[in-house]
């Protein structure tokens, strides 16, 4: 088992909004849960976009999930990752 490296980034979207993206890379096996939580509960799937789980050329995999949020409400969102029985949560950077 190779645990993922998780990285959260933010980018400007429309006025007053930002897109936050959570990327997991260099993990094996390929089964992974990567999702956004808002206010500690699940964020609707309809408001999230997922990338495919793709090989990254080193025998491991990578994927991402993104959502659009209101600027100033970053604290309310965390990216949750679960892989091979381990888990972690990742805040949006300031």
């Amino acid at each position: 088992t190779v645990p993922p490296m998780v990285n959260v980034t933010r980018s400007e979207a429309s006025e007053g909004n930002i897109t936050v993206t959570c990327r997991a890379s260099s993990f094996y096996p390929r089964n992974i849960i990567l999702t956004w939580r808002q206010d500690g509960v699940s964020l609707s799937h309809a408001t999230q976009q997922w990338g495919d789980v793709l090989p990254d050329g080193n025998g491991t995999y990578q994927t991402w999930v993104a959502t659009r949020i209101c600027r100033g409400e970053e604290q309310r969102f965390t990216c949750y990752m679960e892989h091979s029985g381990n888990h972690s949560t990742h805040p949006v950077p300031s």
Partner: antibody, heavy 119, light 107 residues
Framework: DVQLQESGPGLVKPSQSLSLTCTVT?????????WNWIRQFPRNKLEWMGY???????NYNPSLKSRISITRDTSKNQFFLQLISVTTEDTATYYC????????????WGQGTLVTVSA | DIQMTQSPASLSASVGETVTITCRAS??????LAWYQQKQGKSPQLLVY???MLADGVPSRFSASGSGTQYSLKINSLQPEDFGSYYC?????????FGAGTKVEIK
């Protein structure tokens, strides 16, 4: 360590308002987290009532929405529960707690305060 | 609302026995589940979060598992301090709801 302490009257008359205070020490309620009220009825059933978060946003259990208000006093690092038009069915032990945004579970609770609704 | 159904409502066990408590959600909660222990006259204490993760300081005789709508809490080699009530709680969506509890008593 975050510590929470509930306070308020132990006896309320039917049709009146129930008002409780949660005093938080060891952490500023404006820094982060969701600050919650949970109650436990005499037969031990637990009910999540609602929260006020670090920015003052509230979220209430729909079963209580018309009767509940959660507010705060940031200068005293306290948050409050008000429940109007109480009946004997509101007799319960009331707890304050908090959760972090990595998941809505409750790592620490106050010691609880029993409120009896009776004429 | 998601309803949480716990079983059994109560059980009697001896020190050293293994006990299992189950919790069923009325919909898929995708491992968004916590377990609490409550002793008489005390506040609930967090045991497990994210369905399987033991909270800080929880002894390794406790373990938890499950997925979808079915979850369980297992206590290996029950100790005197383990007697009390146990509650599950989902955090998939609002409102957050709890199971009705399982009371673990001394046989």
């Amino acid at each position: 360590d975050v510590q929470l302490q509930e306070s308020g009257p132990g006896l309320v008359k039917p049709s009146q308002s129930l008002s409780l205070t949660c005093t938080v020490t060891g952490y500023s309620i404006t820094s982060d987290y969701a600050w919650n009220w949970i109650r436990q009825f005499p037969r031990n059933k637990l009910e999540w009532m609602g929260y006020i978060n670090y920015s003052g946003t509230t979220n209430y259990n729909p079963s209580l929405k018309s009767r509940i208000s959660i507010t705060r006093d940031t200068s005293k690092n306290q948050f409050f529960l008000q429940l109007i038009s109480v009946t004997t069915e509101d007799t319960a032990t009331y707890y304050c707690s908090y959760y972090r945004y990595d998941g809505a579970w409750f790592p620490y609770w106050g010691q609880g305060t029993l409120v009896t609704v009776s004429a | 609302d998601i309803q949480m159904t716990q079983s059994p409502a109560s059980l009697s066990a001896s020190v050293g026995e293994t006990v299992t408590i189950t919790c069923r959600a009325s919909g898929n909660i995708h491992n968004y589940l916590a377990w609490y222990q409550q002793k008489q006259g005390k506040s609930p204490q967090l045991l497990v979060y994210n369905a399987i993760m033991l909270a800080d300081g929880v002894p390794s005789r406790f373990s938890a598992s499950g997925s979808g709508t079915q979850y369980s809490l297992k206590i290996n080699s029950l100790q005197p301090e383990d007697f009390g009530s146990y509650y599950c709680q989902h955090f998939w969506s609002f409102p957050l709801t709890f199971g009705a509890g399982t009371k673990v008593e001394i046989k």
